[in-house]
Amino acid sequence: KFSKQSWGLENEALIVRCPRQGKPSYTVDWYYSQTNKSIPTQERNRVFASGQLLKFLPAAVADSGIYTCIVRSPTFNRTGYANVTIYKKQSDCNVPDYLMYSTVSGSEKNSKIYCPTIDLYNWTAPLEWFKNCQALQGSRYRAHKSFLVIDNVMTEDAGDYTCKFIHNENGANYSVTATRSFTVKDEQGFSLFPVIGAPAQNEIKEVEIGKNANLTCSACFGKGTQFLAAVLWQLNGTKITDFGEPRIQQEEGQNQSFSNGLACLDMVLRIADVKEEDLLLQYDCLALNLHGLRRHTVRLSRKNPIDHHS
């Protein structure tokens, strides 16, 4: 139930987060499951634990295995498992499927490729980007924060994109790479002021306390490929990443679909283990392009509300 797959390449940094959460003040102990051997916390070790994080600096193939993290709460010890696989570097340019993160799609005038897992690392811009092992050069490619923007995308831009960055730990630098596929949807068309298909304006969405909930922000921007079109969620007028609630996350990247010939984007907001407090928040679905911005507001309500004191 509390298990997570992680993978990396030998001689690169790999950082893994414990699947169990807890207050920042809680101690987290890590163990190598096969031997029950404790992972040290001293940073002089190549593999060491740092609170919720397990760090391989750098990783070795022999590090592969299942790691147990135990969050020491005041009452119980809560256990999670990280299934780590470290692979040998490929001699050729082929990136095997098992090293690939989720595929993202782009279009002629709207493309963003996010660098997977980068938020776990202590890195500084710029990122380096490669396609099929070749460094990306030219004004069409712009490394912006944790993603790559490709201007005037062509079908030939489809392929496997690798981001490379440096993780810094106490003055020492370690390389990290991550690869994902990029597909291109090619279509000529026109651009419109954004039309939000879902949610409806001032929609009330019923959710069950303690369960997971998904909110989809879906908007169309015209026909064919779009330039600078985006959908995103805000909480109480704040970006999801700035709001600081780990249970509430946007789906990484934006899914593009073509509905009745229209170019549409959707962004799923995932709320894990819905809390009473979530009902107090204002959820804004924002759709924007060169024509302007449209906002639809959603609020959550408890399904079949009853007095929770029973």
Partner: antibody, heavy 121, light 106 residues
């Protein structure tokens, strides 16, 4: 919707035992630890202990350790609190309670309606 | 165990007045939770993690503090705020509650 429904009031004689039940619904029973808190008439709240329904593991307040037993039945999503060697000062309302988000221990967001246990000869 | 001391034991104020309830802890804790209890009812969570307002709780309730001293404030008392208020720590086992502060509305 989360509900914690407790068994009815009990009258017991000193030296006897009492077993109070708390049936949970509206969420995945094994995902959340359940706690027991008691309140003597006109007094404050006192934490007795907690049970992890997934494993059956328990943590008791040392004050009750010799006399309290918490168990669970996953098939009925019910936890039980048994207190033995009852004395008059055990007369109290007994509550089961649950945190909102288990891993964050963010206070008791859900409470049962309470079970009054009266110990009298 | 961590001992929680609430003061005052009783607070008698008029509607619209500001109520300040204190909770002093025998050793430092990271967070504090606050509950309201009315006669014949189960406690109700008001504030969690020191300052976060629980769902459905009016904004006139607020919490603050750190270390060994924590405060619950009711900015403008309403008649329905008459109740006993408890602080609780979840820093170490056994979990403990304060003895309560009774708020009376004149």
């Amino acid at each position: 919707q989360v509900q914690l429904v407790q068994s009815g009031a009990e009258v017991k004689k000193p030296g006897a035992s009492v077993k109070v039940s708390c049936k949970a619904s509206g969420y995945t029973f094994t995902d959340y630890e359940l706690h027991w808190v008691r309140q003597a008439p006109g007094q404050g709240l006192e934490w007795m202990g907690t049970i992890d329904p997934e494993t059956g593991d328990t943590v008791y307040n040392q004050k009750f350790k010799a006399r309290v037993t918490m168990t669970r039945d996953t098939s009925t999503s019910t936890v039980y609190m048994e207190l033995s060697s009852l004395r008059s000062e055990d007369t109290a309302v007994y509550y089961c309670a649950r945190a909102f988000y288990n891993d964050y221990d963010d206070g008791f967001a859900y409470w049962g309606q309470g079970t009054l246990v009266t110990v009298s000869s | 165990e961590i001992v929680m001391t609430q003061s005052p034991a009783t607070l008698s104020l008029s509607p619209g007045e500001r109520a300040t309830l204190s909770c002093s802890v025998s050793s430092s804790v990271s967070y504090m939770h606050w509950y309201q209890q009315k006669p014949g009812q189960a406690p109700r969570r008001l504030i969690y993690d020191t300052s976060k307002l629980a769902s459905g709780i009016p904004a006139r309730f607020s919490g603050s503090g750190s270390g060994t001293d924590y405060t619950l404030t009711i900015s403008s008392l309403e008649p329905e705020d008459a109740a006993v208020y408890y602080c609780q720590q979840w820093n170490s086992s056994p979990l403990t509650f304060g003895g309560g502060t009774k708020v009376e509305i004149k």
